[in-house]
């Protein structure tokens, strides 16, 4: 492939990206009555609005409010379950515990994600061969700027106990560059946020060590009480197990430290 | 050595298709994309589009788009350009240009006159 | 069709330097890093000079150079031969995987 056909180093467009965007927001509104009135159509053409014709490196959190403002979701503020590097495991909890809700649980987050899009400045045409990387070309991306602004909205929704999963097996468990340590930790709002509760899961089946020790989650603690919002911590030593006892509470083998 | 080899010179009536083929030898033909760029009498180059030998996809300047077919027969290393409907501005040399990877064309073909008179 | 813009003719004498420029876009010309510059004598067909903006390949005299600024490409001629006398073809990536070229420039050797 020439050079000018990989103008951005990260890999580019999903194929089918319009027709995939489209058809979540169908199945979506399907499942979810109370987003039965969203128009997809539209939905799509605010989602398209925000990056065709405009260079991939120059996207505003502004290109994105159309879009927004359709997307605009009333989830439980207090059931919301923020999650850094540790996806699946997050999104099967909501799957189980279902009166949760991660980001992608939303509209906007439902439709966007695993996904990748960006368009060329001055042309209507969608880039399927590459997209610009957030460290090798430009942060202010379409993919980067699109969760960033969904990321920010959904962090200052939240109120009571927000919960973050965060990953135990990964060198910095609480990484301030995630989306969670830099949009969302400082985006939960003081006033309606009484505390932040991390679950740090382990990787290891062997692994005892309290992670709620580290350095990074004490790091973690120290921002998040700077904001005049309490911190708590739990160990989530097998997965496996704290899945099974989410889908079946009353088992015997659940009452002890999971 | 590289080397394009085009077809010999045309003349057409306005209306009519043309199709200009560039034999290409000295090197592996799908490994490159293929540019056509054309010269009127006098004037500048002008591009027409490209061919991906390998896959055979395309991609044509949008002035074309419609009128231009760009194909390729990998057996015998030969791409090939077919204009239709023809008008007497169409009347130019047209050129075959590999494209070595950086949207430069570093080897090009000897050009066929292409001639639309009626 | 949009093409870049270079000036109809430029002379200069032996020995001495000359500029083409070469005004695009910021989506052509100053978009990438994908200007190559030709040289083309009467009846000939084109020969590239430099590539992705300032590469020469193999076989072009260092005489022959290539720069950018913004949306405007240049092919700079250093110690002027007769010989160079020709026009002069910029042709830039264009995204949306095409390519413009400019409207030429005669070159002329005093």
């Known amino acids: 492939v020439p050079r000018w056909r990989q103008q951005w180093s990260g890999p580019g467009t999903t194929k089918r990206f319009p027709e995939t965007v489209l058809a979540r927001c169908v199945k979506y509104t399907e499942i979810h009555p109370e987003m039965r009135h969203v128009d997809c159509q539209s939905v799509w053409d605010a989602f398209k609005g925000a990056f065709i014709s405009k260079h991939p490196c120059n996207i505003t959190e502004e290109d994105y409010q159309p879009l927004m403002k359709l997307g605009t979701q009333t989830v439980p503020c207090n059931k919301i379950l923020l999650w850094s590097r540790i996806k699946d495991l997050a999104h099967q909890f909501t799957q189980v515990q279902r009166d949760m809700f991660t980001l992608e649980d939303t509209l906007l987050g439902y439709l966007a994600d695993d996904l990748t899009w960006c368009g060329e400045f001055n042309t209507s045409k969608i880039n399927y061969q590459s997209c610009p990387d957030w460290r090798k070309d430009c942060s202010n991306n379409p993919v980067s700027v699109f969760w960033k602004t969904v990321s920010r909205r959904f962090a200052e929704a939240a109120c009571d106990v927000v919960h973050v999963m965060l990953n135990g097996s990964r060198s910095k468990i609480f990484d301030k560059n995630s989306t969670f340590g830099s949009v969302e930790v400082h985006n939960l709002q003081p006033e309606k946020v009484q505390t932040l509760e991390a679950w740090v899961i382990h990787g290891g089946r062997e692994d005892s060590r309290d992670l709620c020790q580290d350095p990074t989650i004490k790091e973690l603690e120290s921002i998040i009480s700077k904001r005049n919002i309490q911190f708590s911590c739990k160990n989530i030593y097998r997965p496996d197990k704290f899945l099974q006892c989410v889908k079946n509470p009353e088992d015997s083998s659940c009452t002890s430290e999971i | 050595q590289v080397q394009l080899v085009e077809s010999g010179a045309e003349v057409k009536k306005p209306g009519a298709s043309v199709k200009v083929s560039c034999k290409a030898s000295?090197?592996?033909?799908?490994?490159?994309?293929m540019h056509w760029v054309r010269q009127a009498p006098g004037q500048g180059l002008e591009w027409m589009g490209w061919?991906?030998?390998?896959?055979?996809?395309?991609n044509y300047a949008q002035k074309f788009q419609g009128r231009v077919t760009m194909t390729r027969d990998t057996s015998i290393s030969t791409a090939y350009m077919e204009l239709s409907r023809l008008r007497s501005d169409d009347t130019a040399v047209y050129y075959c240009?590999?494209?070595?990877?950086?949207?430069?064309?570093?080897?090009w073909g000897q050009g066929t006159l292409v001639t639309v008179s009626s | 069709q949009p093409v870049l813009t270079q000036p109809a003719s430029v002379s200069g004498s032996p020995g001495q330097s000359i500029t083409i420029s070469c005004t695009g876009t910021s989506s052509d010309v100053g978009g990438y890093n994908f200007v190559s510059w030709y040289q083309q004598h009467p009846g000939k067909a084109p020969k590239l000079m430099i590539y992705?903006?300032?590469k020469r390949p193999s076989g072009v005299p260092d005489r022959f150079s290539g720069s950018k600024s913004g949306n405007t490409a240049s092919l700079t001629i250093s110690g002027l031969q007769a010989e160079d006398e020709a026009d002069y073809y910029c042709c830039s990536y264009a995204g949306s995987d095409t390519f413009v070229f400019g409207t030429g420039t005669k070159l002329t050797v005093l």
């Open positions: 061919i991906n030998p390998n896959s055979g996809g395309t």
């Open positions: 240009a590999r494209d070595p990877g950086g949207g430069d064309f570093d080897y």
């Open positions: 992705e903006g300032s």
């Open positions: 000295g090197y592996t033909f799908t490994g490159y994309y």
